[in-house]
Amino acid sequence: GPVPPSTALRELIEELVNITQNQKAPLCNGSMVWSINLTAGMYCAALESLINVSGCSAIEKTQRMLSGFCPHKVSAGQFSSLHVRDTKIEVAQFVKDLLLHLKKLFREGQFN
């Protein structure tokens, strides 16, 4: 059957932990992505930011997992209003910020 939302979120959190702890060199060669507002619709916005990073195997699983939380198809070059379009940050910082926010969502029972 389908994976419960709580399990899916926990698995996403654990994948982000793995990414942050396995950094030997700069994540995705120091690629920059648009910062996002960590609010409703945040999963799609996060995917829209990360999907523009190509050739980075470290975040491919994260991209796939985020797509499971986003109700519509996301493709490169697509942007929502949730992006802070004047602020770009390194993928590593983006992942750390997203991880902390997801841990708080998990605590609050916001699994979707």
Epitope: R10, I13, E14, V17, T20, Q21, L99, L100, K103, K104, F106, R107, E108, G109, Q110
Partner: antibody
Framework: QMQLVESGGGVVQPGRSLRLSCAAS????????MHWVRQAPGKGLEWVGV????????HYADSVKGRFTITRDNSKNTLNLQMNSLRAEDTAVYYC???????????????WGQGTMVTVSS | SYILTQPPSVSVAPGQTARITCGGN??????VHWYQQKPGQAPVLVIY???DRPSRIPERFSGSNIGNTATLTIERVEEGDEADYYC???????????FGGGTKLTVL
């Protein structure tokens, strides 16, 4: 100001019972999860258990499960810890602690009482 | 049940930086809180949610949480920082709150 005041500590024989109380003031008691934490002399902190804001759920440390019961009376802003079948290893300072309530009780303990000493000895 | 491992003691000279670690399996997936306890007193929250600081706590205190290790960092250590420090997480698999064993910070 916001305050938690424990009472009911003392010396008790092994196998006997004791009831601790905690009076809360200065904040909206019914909106907080409430925990008990204990500290044996010269030892570290040990979580005892939690009761949710509305009293609907309790969780206990394995070391006290089946012997200790946490209750609360939101109309009187009081938290209780009923301790039965006490053992020497239950000797400790017992702290009443509050934590904001979410779906999980994973919030930090932002207010502590001064603690009350429980000594289990024959 | 979930286990948090802290070094029993850390020593540092005044003005230097103290780092107190808290190890746990994939602790980075959990929200970590830190408490300071001075002799004869109740613990005080110094860091919550990995890296947030209560308003009354000096900026010298900071926290991080990556992989299997959370770290409490105290910069420009003062004699008044000498205390026991405890990390804490909620283990959602057992519905238990868990404390580390505590670390005694000694200011030389």
């Amino acid at each position: 100001q916001m305050q938690l005041v424990e009472s009911g500590g003392g010396v008790v024989q092994p196998g006997r019972s004791l009831r601790l109380s905690c009076a809360a003031s200065g904040f909206e008691f019914r909106t907080y999860g409430m925990h008990w934490v204990r500290q044996a002399p010269g030892k570290g902190l040990e979580w005892v258990g939690v009761i949710w804001d509305d009293g609907s759920n309790t969780h206990y440390a394995d070391s006290v499960k089946g012997r200790f019961t946490i209750t609360r009376d939101n109309s009187k802003n009081t938290l209780n810890l009923q301790m039965n079948s006490l053992r020497a290893e239950d000797t400790a300072v017992y702290y009443c602690v509050r934590a904001p309530q979410w779906y999980l009780t994973a919030e930090a303990f932002d207010l502590w009482g001064q603690g009350t000493m429980v000594t289990v000895s024959s | 049940s979930y286990i948090l491992t802290q070094p029993p003691s850390v020593s540092v000279a005044p003005g230097q930086t103290a780092r107190i670690t808290c190890g746990g399996n994939l602790i980075g997936a959990k929200l970590v809180h830190w408490y300071q306890q001075k002799p004869g007193q109740a613990p005080v929250l110094v860091i919550y949610d990995d890296s947030d600081r209560p308003s009354r706590i000096p900026e010298r205190f900071s926290g991080s949480n990556i992989g299997n290790t959370a770290t409490l960092t105290i910069e420009r250590v003062e004699e008044g920082d000498e205390a026991d420090y405890y990390c804490q997480v909620w283990d959602y698999s057992s519905d238990h709150m868990v404390f580390g064993g505590g670390t005694k910070l000694t200011v030389l």
